[in-house]
Structure formats: structure tokens, C-alpha cells
């Protein structure tokens, strides 16, 4: 059950796991949600009736019964973890806390013009968890405008005290706002030889990497596989850090894999949930419950529904089965990871999916796609929308992409002659245009935001945002696509697809079924040679075959150029313009989305 409301002047009695300091009850709830065992919490707000040393304490709690006795206490605010809540949970916290000094290890002190600049510095510093900034009104003249970057072992302050004329806040890495590069590759046969901050058991390097990403101090990791020669270290995931933020030494070692935290590329971050099921593997841990179920998937669902369950083992041993049902062992541990991993067993293991609604929905696995055909299948491009105009009659106008639960990214040139957002309708989860009837539900458009430097498609800035009147509930057939990370400007995308209901040749009509075409990216240098009469800027990106034959065309405008990188789909381009359609040596020209990430974030996150 998902309980979101906070209980004022209420304290949960007992069940304490640990105490951390948070600047607000809201943030205490987020910390509880991400903690492997926390189900409930009690936060103490500042109050004259309360001992100041207890102000801002956030006590994380657990209970076998999933609840605890309530006691009335002034200034106490209690609530439940967001584990199992179906709405999106995010660690992103943009709040600025006035007159609060969030204490931690100050590791960088420098002058900044504003609190915003200080927060940006923190967001772009690999070690920074939070900051404190002394404002222009700070009593000590010499400390005015000083920006202190801080970190701690837990990622939360070691203490929070009142202090006039300072402001504090958190790094916005988890809000997709970091400009740090993120390295998504996992390096085989590699050991990073730096200091270990923690170690856990993991079934593979991908799980190890996700654990590293969500661990506040982890910057990179080394994972020893099942074939690692030293038996005691098999399946060990070492979470590491270094002063420089990068590994100081890489050692070539067979059967080890290493990689980096993806904390700085949170808009394509792996969620803190591991959906894969591991056959022939036993996850050891504290026994929570044993139940008979039919099949490993039902076992995983059972674990997910039981809020305290962290991982499970489904046994196929004859003595553990009755007819079609077998034993499902529901387990937990202190850190959320198995305490041991055994191979060669008759059964399968996996993790609870209770935190799969955290992070960005854009990273959630999409159904396997059918490659080779030209018609798409349902759910293949769940971010693709069809934008209709109702004036003078209803028709498909342009494509677009869902990038947030209230936002569609499309091309500016689509709105030539569109006087008002009232005539627009956005349809999502559509495969065939014929599905759209009078009674088909759609999203009204509240606002059209066209880039203020846009003049015409060929001169660039061909980008627009549509703010929807209502929010999109994410499902398998409608969910967002990730924006590319600014740190990934140098990534060479090799798996790019253009989609839309546009013409299949220059003189044609809108297609009924959503079409797809795999198209290679072309360098801007090469593209410029093909369009000598135009200026191909770095804010444009080109794609097409030299011989032509596959391309976007009229009606595809505004739709996505989607590229898959490290199992995550990114919105690399917006269909913009081109000479004809699929002509030889005339690539399609797309708006280069990575160059507009700041603009998108500025517009979508404006208060």
C-alpha cells in the first residue's frame, strides 16, 4: 500500500535503524525510500519546544508489521517510505534551504557570485553531495560569497544547524543537470586499484554498476565474476573512490570487470532496481517468508508486493515442489544485496522490483523491437506521439516525443500558421492513425514554446516544446525517451532510427501505420558537403545513406531520431528538414538535441 501523506506532530515509536540529518521531512522521506530497509520515518523540525541538537534529525525505521505505534510529539513529522508507490520517485531535490548550515566534509572553498553558481559548482563536481553558501549579508565580511562544497559517507549532512545569512542545498546530479561526462562502458578483464569504500555481493557487473550509481560515495567499481580464481571473492562488487574521481591504476586481470558510477548522467540512469532473473543461482539472506507459487515470475511479483522483501530464490528441487507450485524464498539483508550467491542450484533468483518506479522512466526497458521491417509494432516506440490539428479539419500535423509527463518535444516549423494551442491534440500510444476516432482520448496543449531564435528550419533552432494540459501516466505504450547527456557529446551512436507516419515518397500521403527506418549518422563535415548552399551548424545533426533510399519525409517532422546507447534510447535528433526525401547524397537534417538540453531544462523546470 502506498501512503504519501505526512503525519504532523506524530512520532513513530521504536523500530529505529539509523539516524541521519535532512533539511526537511520531504527529503527524509526520499532518504527512507532509497534505504534498503526503511519503511517508516520520523523527522524532527526546528521548534522552541525541542532540543536544538535534535532539530533536523531523520530517524529511519523498520517494522515486521510494516507499521509502528504512533505517539503525539510537537515538531515531529512522520511518514512512510515511497517504496511500492507507483508514481515516479526521484532523488532530485532543487530546494534551497535558507539559514541552514548543512555540515559535512568541506573539501573545496571558493568564491561564487550566487547560491545558484555554488549549486552548479556542486553539481559539476564529482565528489559534491551538498553545499553551503554564505550570502552577501553574512556577518563575517571575509566569508561572504564563499561557496563550500561538501561530501559525507552517506551523502546526507552529518549535522544541520541554524546559521543566519547562509543557504544550503544539494547537488543536482540526480536532476539530470550535471555537465560531468559519464562513462557507460563496462571494461572486461580490468581491475581498478583504488580505495574500497564498500563491498556487496552481486550476480553480475550490471547490478554492481547500478549499486555503485546509487551509492553516495561510489565513483567506480570492480566486479569479480563467478569464474574469478579466488573463491572467497567471487561475485564480489567493490565500490571505489579516489581523490581525482578517476581510477589511478587499471590492472589487466581476467574474469574481473570494472566500470563507472552513472551518477552524473541521471537522465539515463539505471533505476535502483534489478529486473533480471538468474537461473541456477541461489541468493542467500535473512529468511522473511516462504510461500508456494507457480513459476519464478510469480515469485518475483510476490517479493515485490511484500514491501520488506529485497530478493528471492525460487526452488525447483523436487522436495520443494507440490504439483505445479514450488517454494519461493523471500529474503532480505542489511544492505539490500544477497549475503552469498551460490551457483549450480536447482532454481532461480532475482530481486524485488519495489524501486522500479524510481529514477527516470525513460530508461525502463522497451519491448524487443522487430528489426528489418518498415512497419513498427505496438509499444516499439512508446515516446512517439502524433500531433493533430483540428483546423480546418482534423489531420496529422507532425510527430513529437514524450520527454516528461507533461512535455512533448517537437519541431518549431510544425507551428507555421498555428494561431492557438487550442486547435492541437496530442495522441500517445498510437500505432495506426485509423485508431484515432471521435472518442479517442488525447492530451490538450496548454502552451507552445518555440525557441526564440527560430526563424526557419534551414537556419536552425527548429525546436519547440508543448506543455500538456494534463499529465501522461506512463505505461508500456506511452513513456518518455531520455534526453542525451551533455557529457555524451562525443558518443558515436551506431543504432539510430527515424520514425513517423510521414510520406513514403515525396508525393504521397500520411501513412496509417507508424513507419521506422534505421539510418546511420553522417558527420557535419560530410553533411556540409551535401548542402553547400546551407550552413550546417553544430546545433544540427545529419543522418542518411549515401545512396539514399531511407529517410524521413513530410509528416515525420518534429518526430524523433532515436539512438540506442548502452541499452538506453536517447532522443538524439528532431526531424527538421532536407532536400527532397531519401535522395542520393542528401541526408536528412535534424535538430541536434544535446545542444538544447539546457534550453529544454530551463523551459520545463521553470516554476
Amino acid at each position: 500500500e502506498c501512503v504519501t501523506q505526512l503525519l504532523k506532530d506524530t512520532c513513530f515509536e521504536g523500530g529505529d535503524i539509523t539516524t541521519v540529518f535532512t533539511p526537511s521531512a520531504k527529503y527524509c522521506q526520499v532518504v527512507c525510500t532509497y534505504h534498503p530497509r526503511c519503511l517508516l520515518f520520523t523527522f524532527t523540525a526546528e521548534s522552541p519546544s525541542e532540543d536544538p541538537t535534535r532539530w533536523f534529525t531523520c530517524v529511519l525505521k523498520d517494522s515486521v508489521t510494516e507499521t509502528l505505534p504512533r505517539v503525539n510529539r510537537t515538531a515531529a513529522i512522520s511518514g512512510y517510505s515511497f517504496k511500492q508507490c507507483s508514481h515516479q520517485i526521484s532523488a532530485c531535490n532543487k530546494d534551497i534551504y535558507v539559514d541552514l548550515d548543512m555540515k559535512g566534509i568541506n573539501y573545496n572553498s571558493s568564491v561564487a557570485k550566487s547560491a545558484q553558481e555554488c549549486q552548479e559548482r556542486c553539481t559539476d563536481d564529482v565528489h559534491c553531495h551538498f553545499f553551503t553558501y554564505a550570502t552577501r549579508q553574512f556577518p563575517s565580511l571575509e566569508h561572504r560569497n564563499i561557496c563550500l562544497l561538501k561530501h559525507t559517507q552517506t551523502g546526507t549532512p552529518t549535522r544541520i544547524t541554524k546559521l543566519d545569512k547562509v543557504v544550503s542545498g544539494f547537488s543536482l546530479k540526480s536532476c539530470a543537470l550535471s555537465n560531468l561526462a559519464c562513462i557507460r562502458d563496462i571494461f572486461p578483464n580490468t581491475v581498478f586499484a583504488d580505495s574500497n569504500i564498500d563491498s556487496v555481493m552481486a550476480p553480475d557487473a550490471f547490478v554492481c554498476g547500478r549499486i555503485c550509481t546509487h551509492h553516495p560515495g561510489c565513483l567506480f567499481f570492480t566486479f569479480f565474476s563467478q569464474e574469478w580464481p579466488k573463491e572467497s571473492q567471487r561475485n564480489l562488487c567493490l565500490l571505489k573512490t579516489s581523490e581525482s574521481g578517476l581510477p589511478s591504476t587499471r590492472i589487466k586481470k581476467s574474469k574481473a570487470l570494472s566500470g563507472f558510477s552513472l551518477q552524473s548522467c541521471r537522465h539515463s540512469i539505471p533505476v535502483p532496481c534489478h529486473s533480471k532473473i538468474y537461473p541456477g543461482v541461489d541468493f542467500g539472506g535473512e529468511e522473511l517468508n516462504v510461500t508456494f507459487v507457480k513459476g519464478v515470475n510469480v515469485c518475483q511479483e510476490t517479493c515485490t508486493k511484500m514491501i520488506r522483501c529485497q530478493f528471492f530464490t525460487y526452488s525447483l528441487l523436487p522436495e520443494d515442489c507440490k504439483e505445479e507450485k514450488c517454494k519461493c524464498f523471500l529474503r532480505l539483508s542489511m544492505d539490500g544485496s544477497p549475503t552469498r550467491i551460490a551457483y549450480g542450484t536447482q532454481g532461480s533468483s532475482g530481486y524485488s522490483l519495489r524501486l522500479c518506479n524510481t529514477g527516470d522512466n525513460c530508461t525502463t526497458k522497451i519491448k524487443p523491437r522487430i528489426v528489418g521491417g518498415t512497419a513498427s509494432v505496438r509499444g516499439e516506440w512508446p515516446w512517439q506521439v502524433t500531433l493533430h490539428t483540428t483546423s480546418p479539419t482534423q489531420r496529422h500535423l507532425c510527430g513529437g516525443s514524450i520527454i516528461g509527463n507533461q512535455w512533448i518535444l517537437t519541431a518549431a516549423h510544425c507551428f507555421y500558421g498555428v494561431e492557438s494551442p487550442k486547435i492541437l491534440r496530442v495522441y500517445s500510444g498510437i500505432l495506426n492513425q485509423s485508431e484515432i476516432k471521435e472518442d479517442t482520448s488525447f492530451f490538450g496543449v496548454q502552451e507552445i514554446i518555440i525557441h526564440d531564435q527560430y526563424k526557419m528550419a534551414e537556419s536552425g533552432y527548429d525546436i519547440a516544446l508543448l506543455k500538456l494540459e494534463t499529465t501522461v501516466n506512463y505505461t508500456d505504450s506511452q513513456r518518455p525517451i531520455c534526453l542525451p547527456s551533455k557529457g555524451d557529446r562525443n558518443v558515436i551512436y551506431t543504432d539510430c532510427w527515424v520514425t513517423g507516419w510521414g510520406y513514403r515518397k515525396l508525393r504521397d500521403k500520411i501513412q496509417n501505420t507508424l513507419q521506422k527506418a534505421k539510418i546511420p549518422l553522417v558527420t557535419n563535415e560530410e553533411c556540409q558537403k551535401r548542402y553547400r548552399g546551407h550552413k550546417i551548424t553544430h546545433k544540427m545533426i545529419c543522418a542518411g545513406y549515401r545512396e539514399g533510399g531511407k529517410d524521413a519525409c513530410k509528416g515525420d517532422s518534429g518526430g524523433p531520431l532515436s539512438c540506442k546507447h548502452n541499452e538506453v534510447w536517447h532522443l538524439v535528433g528532431i526531424t527538421s528538414w532536407g532536400e527532397g526525401c531519401a535522395q542520393r547524397e542528401r541526408p536528412g537534417v535534424y535538430t541536434n538535441v544535446v545542444e538544447y538540453v539546457d534550453w529544454i531544462l530551463e523551459k520545463t523546470q521553470a516554476v
Epitope: 566534509i105 553574512f138 556577518p139
Partner: antibody, heavy 116, light 107 residues
Framework: QVQLEESGPGLVAPSQSLSITCTVS????????IYWVRQPPGKGLEWLGM???????DYNSALKSRLSISKDNSKSQVFLKMNSLQTDDTARYYC??????????WGQGTTLTVSS | DIVMTQSHKFMSTSVGDRVSITCKAS??????VAWYQQKPGQSPKLLIY???YRNTGVPDRFTGSGSGTDFTFTISSVQAEDLAVYYC?????????FGGGTKLERL
């Protein structure tokens, strides 16, 4: 935990130079300023100078010409150098960590005697 | 440079008494004044910073007040372990400076 420890020569002859090292642990010198304060026997505290996290320095006006403060962030060490020592420079020398201009952690101090 | 003056070099008190130590700055230092306690043979210990903020672990019998040029440090109920020398320090502007100190002794 936070610790500061001063180490100095103990005895210096007049007109000679002084070099004292403050070795810190439990925090980073890039994030905190470090102060030098001295206390002559039976007297009060005198502020000598400081080095900020970003390397800037500030000195006591009366001693500015004789003082130099530097640091090595990687070794977690701060150095106080003072030349042309006189007998009235005899004192206990402390290093302390900055907290918004106040000094929240102090070393135990090192005693310097200027005598021939 | 800013000069900090503690008018009383010595103050006599008894256990349980309320005692106030004053400090005057030669120019406006806003609220950037700290107070330290020093016992014989020990390093100074920060009690109060920015006029009225108690350092971690400092008992609440120690308080500070004032602004501009006049500052007061108060012990609401003196304990035997409070007998020591107390210094004020301005941390408004470098070069920072200390007061001459006030020795709190048994009556």
C-alpha cells in the same frame, strides 16, 4: 576525527628564522582555512595570519613583513615561516581550523623560545 | 585594524552565580564575534561564534549577545569547571583580532 598538530624547532637564536609545520587529519585543506595564533607566556592570544582553502593569505599588519604562510594540500600540511626573530617572539604557537572566521579546532601548540 | 577591548582582566564569582563578560570593538563588526575558553596548559576552545551561536557540545548555560561594537558573554550559572580565561575575537574582517582576555576566578 579532526586533528591538528604543530611541530617546530623549540629553540631559535635571535635574528634567525622560524619554520613551523601544522599537519592536519580528518579534513581537507582545500575546504578549510587555517589560522596561526600565538600566545606569549602568561599573556593573551595574538592572531598571526591565515591561509584560505583556495590558497589566499591574510596577515597581522604588524608582522606582515616577517611572516609567510603556505601549504601543501596533498600532504595536509600548512607552514608558518617567520624571520628576524626577537626574544619577544617567544610564545606558544597554535594552528587552528576556520569556521566562518572563528576557530573550531585547535592544535595543542608548539613552544618556541628565542634565546641565544 | 580593529581593536577588541575586554575591560575586565579579572572577574570573581562563585558557583551558581550569573556572570557577564563584556567586549568592545573599535569599529562596527556586525555580529561577527566569537568567544573562547582557555584553561591552564590547554589550547583555547570555541564556545560561541557569530555572537550567539553555540558550538557543538557547548552547554546551554553559555550564551552570547550584542551587535555592532558591544558584545556580552554570559554564564547563567557558573560551575567549578568554568573557571578559566575567556577571550573575545572579531571575525568580521582580517586581520582578525582577540580581546586581552578575562580571567574568571573563585571569589
Amino acid at each position: 576525527q579532526v586533528q591538528l598538530e604543530e611541530s617546530g624547532p623549540g629553540l631559535v637564536a635571535p635574528s634567525q628564522s622560524l619554520s613551523i609545520t601544522c599537519t592536519v587529519s580528518g579534513f581537507s585543506l582545500t575546504g578549510y582555512g587555517i589560522y596561526w595564533v600565538r600566545q606569549p607566556p602568561g599573556k593573551g592570544l595574538e592572531w598571526l595570519g591565515m591561509i584560505w582553502g583556495d590558497g589566499r593569505t591574510d596577515y597581522n599588519s604588524a608582522l606582515k613583513s616577517r611572516l609567510s604562510i603556505s601549504k601543501d594540500n596533498s600532504k595536509s600540511q600548512v607552514f608558518l615561516k617567520m624571520n628576524s626573530l626577537q626574544t619577544d617572539d617567544t610564545a606558544r604557537y597554535y594552528c587552528a581550523r576556520d569556521y566562518y572566521g572563528s576557530k573550531d579546532y585547535w592544535g595543542q601548540g608548539t613552544t618556541l623560545t628565542v634565546s641565544s | 585594524d580593529i581593536v577588541m577591548t575586554q575591560s575586565h582582566k579579572f572577574m570573581s564569582t562563585s558557583v551558581g552565580d550569573r556572570v557577564s563578560i563584556t567586549c568592545k570593538a573599535s569599529q562596527d563588526v556586525s555580529t561577527a564575534v566569537a568567544w573562547y575558553q582557555q584553561k591552564p596548559g590547554q589550547s583555547p576552545k570555541l564556545l560561541i561564534y557569530l555572537t550567539s551561536y553555540r558550538n557543538t557540545g557547548v552547554p546551554d548555560r553559555f550564551t552570547g549577545s550584542g551587535s555592532g561594537t558591544d558584545f556580552t558573554f554570559t554564564i547563567s550559572s557558573v560551575q567549578a569547571e568554568d573557571l578559566a580565561v575567556y577571550y573575545c575575537q572579531q571575525h568580521y574582517k582580517t586581520p582578525y583580532s582577540f580581546g586581552g582576555g578575562t580571567k574568571l576566578e573563585r571569589l
